[in-house]
């Protein structure tokens, strides 16, 4: 008894084509490109039916269904627009991802994705992974005037990268991307094996304010060249946050220096240090303060710290110095780990040139300078850790 003649499903074809199909004869179904074999909602790798003794096929006919990539995945800090038509997610449909303007920019690709025959949204570069909305760095409400003035109260949005680190001593840091904090190794050394003990706060000006964005540390990475209690060479650390923070006008990462950044950090160029450290009155500041200070010639700074009680070689090539010869403008205890920032006049973005590291016992002392970790020397180290973790 022959089996019923197999009618190919739409967008599919039967092979082999025979005049009739009798016991043990078989046929397979092949779908056109952009269509897939489906039994119900599940993809089939192949389909072959065999004619049985009773004249029926041993399997029901599958469908050749147009490949449907399904609703595209949500893009963190971004959105998706249907280009082909509202809600169209089938083969060759086009969608466009974009990032939330002002605070995020798209990385990896241009955000245009096409539904391909394998059922996945695919970029023009062939990537199946989502694009990345990377936070825009170095945005500030403040514009630099280039003059020197100190002890100013910061206003909202002036230093949106500023991070307050508690859980030991009061220290500071600077937000990188949306889940890393750059700080000084000496500020977090005690917590290197207990990262969760660090209480990280951002998005606030007032040190004691209950209104802030809380972040917690997942891991602390201290530069392998830093030796605690043996000078401040390689005084740099990274804290990985256990969650990404939402970027806004009050929480924005600082940029890392470009290769060309040295041209904005020459002797007498102005950098800005901010923090809640000790003020001239000898107490931790309640409000975030900042000071604009010039970079000091490296030899001059080395000479200032060559005489006792400072051991020879205290100032290394991994450090930069800033301050006034006459004193009075400086960072101080409690500012440790904070960023010394500079304006890149080409990109019009602020970048971190230094990390508050050490200085004379008396902050702002004449003839002594604040010493900062020279961040540009550590770009490969920073990039390696961030890419690996």
């Amino acid at each position: 008894q022959p089996c019923p003649y197999p009618m190919a499903p739409p967008n599919g074809h039967v092979s082999p084509v025979q005049a009739k199909y009798i016991l043990k004869d078989s046929f397979s179904i092949f779908c056109e490109t952009g269509y897939e074999l489906l039994q119900g909602h599940l993809p089939l790798k192949s389909f072959t039916a065999v004619c049985q003794k009773d004249g029926s096929w041993d399997r029901p006919m599958p469908a050749c269904s147009i490949v449907d990539c399904g609703p595209p995945d949500d893009l963190p800090s971004g959105r998706v627009e249907y280009i082909t038509g509202p809600g169209v997610t089938t083969y060759k449909a086009v969608i466009q991802y974009s990032c939330e303007e002002t605070f995020y920019t798209m990385k990896v690709n241009d955000g245009k994705y096409v539904c391909e025959a394998d059922g996945f949204w695919t970029s023009s570069k062939g990537e199946k992974s989502l694009p990345v909305c990377e936070p825009v760095c170095g945005l500030s409400a403040r514009t630099t005037g280039g003059r020197i003035y100190g002890g100013q109260k910061a206003k909202p949005g002036d230093f949106p990268w500023q991070v307050l680190i508690l859980g030991g001593t009061t220290a500071a840091g600077a937000l990188l991307y949306d889940n890393w904090v750059l700080t000084a190794a000496h500020a977090v050394y005690e917590q290197k094996h207990d990262a969760s003990a660090l209480d990280i706060r951002m998005g606030t000006l007032k040190r004691l304010s209950p209104h802030y964005t809380q972040a917690w540390s997942e891991a602390v990475f201290i530069h392998e060249g830093y030796t605690h209690d043996a000078g401040f060479d390689n005084d740099i650390a990274l804290i990985k946050l256990n969650n990404k923070v939402v970027i806004n006008s009050n929480i924005t990462p600082i940029c890392l220096p470009r290769k060309e950044a040295e041209s904005f950090m020459r002797t007498d160029d102005i950098g800005t240090a901010s923090g809640w450290g000790l003020t001239q009155r000898g107490f931790l500041a309640r409000n975030l303060m900042y000071v604009d200070i010039p970079i000091v010639d490296h030899q001059k700074c080395t000479a200032a710290y060559e005489k006792p009680p400072y051991p020879r070689g205290s100032v290394t090539a991994n450090m930069l110095c800033a301050g006034l010869e006459s004193g009075g403008k400086d960072s101080c205890r409690g500012d440790s780990g904070g960023a010394l920032v500079f304006l890149d006049s080409e990109t019009e973005r602020w970048f971190v040139g230094g990390i508050v590291s050490w200085g004379s016992m008396n902050c702002g002392e004449a003839g002594q300078y604040g010493v900062y970790t020279k961040v540009i020397n550590y770009i490969p180290w920073i990039e390696n850790i961030i890419s690996d973790f």
Epitope: L42, G70, P71
Partner: antibody, heavy 118, light 106 residues
Framework: QVTLKESGPVLVKPTETLTLTCTVS??????????VSWIRQPPGKALEWLAH???????SYRTSLKSRLTISKDTSKNQVVLTMTNMDPVDTATYYC??????????WGQGTLVTVSS | QPVLTQPPSVSVSPGQTASITCSGD??????AYWYQQKPGHSPVLVIY???KRPSGIPGRFSGSNSGNTATLTISGTQAMDEADYYC?????????FGTGTKVTVL
């Protein structure tokens, strides 16, 4: 991004009915060829598929448990519910809900440990 | 319910290749899927439809499937690859998981 979260009792008594809820976000339960599966894993043992439901409401159950399982979805709440009747201590396991896409179970919830004990 | 059989354990030295097999009747006619599960964590899809890698899965993971056996291969195995691995296939519209393989990186 895509997330699934299981909720329900951590302890049930033998013969009782277990009701587990899976709340999803980042994808639609009503469109595309997406489905949600329930899978369990007894302590120290292998994964065991229980049931699934697709956007079209097509459902399928593990043959050996078919009479005890019911799966349903509430698209408006982005939820998939699994009920399992006549619970027994051997049903003690971590219960996962997960998304099915292109036949692969590509996103999993964190799982919820359900203990069956009197 | 059909059975997918895996070796209980596979040991491999760092940097070497680990191969995990999954056997089942005419498995090569179906798509095979592979999942990695680390202790205390939910499974993660590492290979779908025999040999495709989801985004975010390193290139050292690859898959093949023919005859009665699907194979997951981890080239240049790293310590972080130590985990349980499960194969899975669809039989009609029901999912079947393998018995699981514990991969130990020596």
């Amino acid at each position: 991004q895509v997330t699934l979260k299981e909720s329900g009792p951590v302890l049930v008594k033998p013969t009782e009915t277990l009701t587990l809820t899976c709340t999803v976000s980042g994808f639609s339960l009503s469109r595309g060829k997406m489905g949600v599966s329930w899978i369990r894993q007894p302590p120290g043992k292998a994964l065991e598929w229980l049931a699934h439901i697709f956007s079209s409401d097509e459902k399928s159950y593990r043959t050996s448990l078919k009479s005890r399982l019911t799966i349903s979805k509430d698209t408006s709440k982005n939820q998939v519910v699994l009920t399992m009747t006549n619970m027994d201590p051997v049903d003690t396991a971590t219960y996962y809900c997960a998304r099915i896409r292109a036949g692969g179970i590509d996103y999993w919830g964190q799982g919820t440990l359900v203990t069956v004990s009197s | 319910q059909p059975v997918l059989t895996q070796p209980p354990s596979v040991s491999v030295s760092p940097g070497q290749t680990a191969s995990i097999t999954c056997s089942g009747d005419k498995l090569g006619d179906k798509f095979a899927y592979w999942y990695q599960q680390k202790p205390g964590h939910s499974p993660v899809l590492v290979i779908y439809q025999d040999n495709k890698r989801p985004s975010g899965i390193p290139g050292r993971f690859s898959g093949s499937n023919s005859g009665n056996t699907a194979t997951l291969t981890i080239s240049g195995t790293q310590a972080m690859d130590e985990a349980d691995y499960y194969c899975q296939a669809w039989d009609s519209s029901t999912a079947v998981f393998g018995t699981g393989t514990k991969v130990t990186v020596l």
